[in-house]
Each structure stands twice: as structure tokens, then as C-alpha cells.
């Protein structure tokens, strides 16, 4: 359930605060990498590799680091100020409407269509009609209609952190 809450979900109204690390809150807020103590008088550091906070905040605890699922690779580890960045393995992608899992990219386009976009960690291959150039709906084609192609190489890492 760690993915259910990010600091964006919990973020209070953003207030400007001086950008230096302090052991006591500045204007009631603690710097990234810290949370506020129960009595509101101290800033307590998050535990490296366990939890984090990304903004100046008055959260009473740090947020849990995301653990990359099987089928994902860790692009960058969790630090006290940044959540783990996970990315789908080559040949798989994560859609916006189903962010909880990586799905296999299609291996090719349906008959009468050409591939114009490779498989990336955040998108399936993109197909368009040969004549009209209009995009395919994204439905997985029947096997016998498939024109095979190899999955593309990720163009750039996709940050999924909060």
C-alpha cells in the first residue's frame, strides 16, 4: 500500500522556507529528508533507504520507500529526499490507467498498419494505418494478424516517483 500515498497526496499548502538544514523547524516546517517531531519542536531525519520526504513539510512521519516489483528495474535508489525510481523491464510498459503493473508490449502491428513508435517503459508500440496515418486503438491484435518486430530500447528513464 506504500504507493497509495505520496507527498503530493499529503502535501500541505506550500510555504516558502529558507533552504538550509536545521534541527528545529523553520516557520513550522522541516526540510526535505526530515519530518517534524510529535511536539513540533524538532526535525527528525528520515532513515536512508527506508523512508523519505521530498518537500518542506510538517508531516509527523516520513513516507515509506517504494520497493520495485518483480518485472521492474530500479533506476535510482531511495534516499532521504527522493523515493525509489522504478521502471518497467525491457519489453514491458506501464500505462497511465493501470500504473500498478507492467504489461507486455505487443510484438507487432495488425495487418495494414505500420509501427511508428517503439516499446518504451511507459508506452506500448505505436501503430498507424498505412494509408491514412491514423493511430490504432491499442487493442492487442490476433496472433495471426501480427507483424513481428523487436521491442525498442528505452529512450529515456521515466520517473514514477511522487
Amino acid at each position: 500500500e506504500s504507493a497509495l500515498i505520496t507527498q503530493q497526496d499529503l502535501a500541505p499548502q506550500q510555504r516558502a522556507a529558507p533552504q538550509q538544514k536545521r534541527s528545529s523547524p523553520s516557520e513550522g516546517l522541516c526540510p526535505p529528508g526530515h519530518h517534524i517531531s510529535e511536539d513540533g519542536r524538532d526535525c527528525i531525519s528520515c532513515k536512508y533507504g527506508q523512508d523519505y520526504s521530498t518537500h518542506w513539510n510538517d508531516l509527523l512521519f516520513c513516507l515509506r520507500c517504494t520497493r520495485c516489483d518483480s518485472g521492474e528495474v530500479e533506476l535510482s535508489p531511495c534516499t532521504t529526499t527522493r523515493n525509489t525510481v522504478c521502471q518497467c523491464e525491457e519489453g514491458t510498459f506501464r500505462e497511465e490507467d493501470s500504473p500498478e503493473m507492467c504489461r507486455k508490449c505487443r510484438t507487432g502491428c495488425p495487418r495494414g498498419m505500420v509501427k511508428v513508435g517503439d516499446c518504451t517503459p511507459w508506452s506500448d508500440i505505436e501503430c498507424v494505418h498505412k494509408e491514412s496515418g491514423t493511430k490504432h486503438s491499442g487493442e492487442v491484435p490476433a496472433v495471426e494478424e501480427t507483424v513481428t518486430s523487436s521491442p525498442g530500447t528505452p529512450a529515456s528513464p521515466c520517473s514514477l516517483s511522487g
Epitope: L10, P12, G28, D51, N57, L59, L60
Partner: antibody
Framework: EVQLVQSGAEVKKPGASVKVSCKAS????????MNWMKQSPGKSLEWIGR????????FYNQKFKGKATLTVDKSTSTAHMELSSLRSEDTAVYFC???????????????WGQGTLVTVSS | DIVMTQSPLSLPVTPGEPASISCRSS???????????LHWYLQKPGQSPQLLIY???NRFSGVPDRFSGSGSGTDFTLKISRVEAEDVGVYYC?????????FGPGTKVEIK
Amino acid sequence: EVQLVQSGAEVKKPGASVKVSCKASGYSFIGYFMNWMKQSPGKSLEWIGRFNPYNGDTFYNQKFKGKATLTVDKSTSTAHMELSSLRSEDTAVYFCGRSAYYFDSGGYFDYWGQGTLVTVSS
Amino acid sequence: DIVMTQSPLSLPVTPGEPASISCRSSQSLVHSNGNTYLHWYLQKPGQSPQLLIYKVSNRFSGVPDRFSGSGSGTDFTLKISRVEAEDVGVYYCSQSTHVPWTFGPGTKVEIK
């Protein structure tokens, strides 16, 4: 609509334990602390402590450490408070109440359960 | 622990008339961050408490504007501009500046 629905009244003998529950609905259960308060007959309110459903942390009023144990079942969005080694002075109505995860807005309870009367009598 | 006191402990009121409840704390409730964490609740007969005012003067959603809170330091006041029959019950002040959070003894408001 935010609702906190508590379990029914209990009658227990001295030395026994009791577990009171508080089922939350109408909001993200892991998005708020769940607090517990005690109201002795004809008396004021005392804050017992709170549970963080997000990470499992508890924070107790020192007075109730060893007396109350707070837990939750995230699968049913239910908070529990177990009171052990019951004595007559534990006879009270116990309330659950929701509070925010932030210091600045976390010290008051915006929604309360209806209360559970626990009677300790031999 | 911070001790909260309220006065009066019992307050007979006439509908349509104003009412005022005082709350005092044994120490200042001004936090080092500059905010004051003093709140008011109403417990109607046979019900659970309900939040009226938070942080001295902020009305909780749905609370009628006849309720107002004021004060600073150790002295606070809840005012009802025109009491209605539905306002009867016990009013509690509460502080969350200092751990543990504590409540006042309550003020019972009843119709004369």
C-alpha cells in the same frame, strides 16, 4: 460521508481484557491517524493515543501505556483498542476519532465514533 | 500535563440571547511555531463530541457562524451570538500544543 462506527457495549470482570473496534468508511483509511479517547462517567475526556495506519506507528499518552494497545486491520479499515488488566476505574465510554497526519492540523479530531461503553464490574 | 479549566461549569441560557464560555490553560498554548492549538468541541446529549472550532478561531465545516472563538496565550473564549435550542450540551476546550493533548472539564449549557 465520513463515518466511524464503533462496536457495542461490553461488560467485563476485573482483571479481564476487552477489545473495542472502530470501523471507518467514507475516506482513505490509511490517510489519517486514528485516535482514542476515554470519557469516564460524568467526567471530561482524556486522549489515550493514536495509531498510524499508513506505517503502523503508535503514539501513546504516557498515562495509558501498558493499559491500551492500539492496532488496525487495514483490509477492513478497522481500528482496534485493547484494554488489559481491567479495573473499575476503566469503566468509561471510549471514542475513536480521526486526525490529520500534519503537526499543524493534527491535534484536533474532525470526526468521532459514537462511543463504546465498557463497564468493569465483579 | 497541561491543565485546562473552564468557567462557568454550568450555564443556563435563554434562546436568542448571547452566551460566553471561558477556557484557561496552566501554560501558554502559543507554540514555538507561532500558532496556538486550542480547540472547542460540543457534546450534545447522548452523542459523541463534535468539532466546533480549531486553532482558536477557525470554524469547522458546517458549524453555524453564530459560534466564534477568540483568545491568546492562556485565556480563550467561545461565544454563541444567539443561542438556539439545539446548542444545548457540554462544551469542551482542548489543547494540542503540548503532549499529551488535554481537555477542559466541560461547560454544560442548558436552556433556562
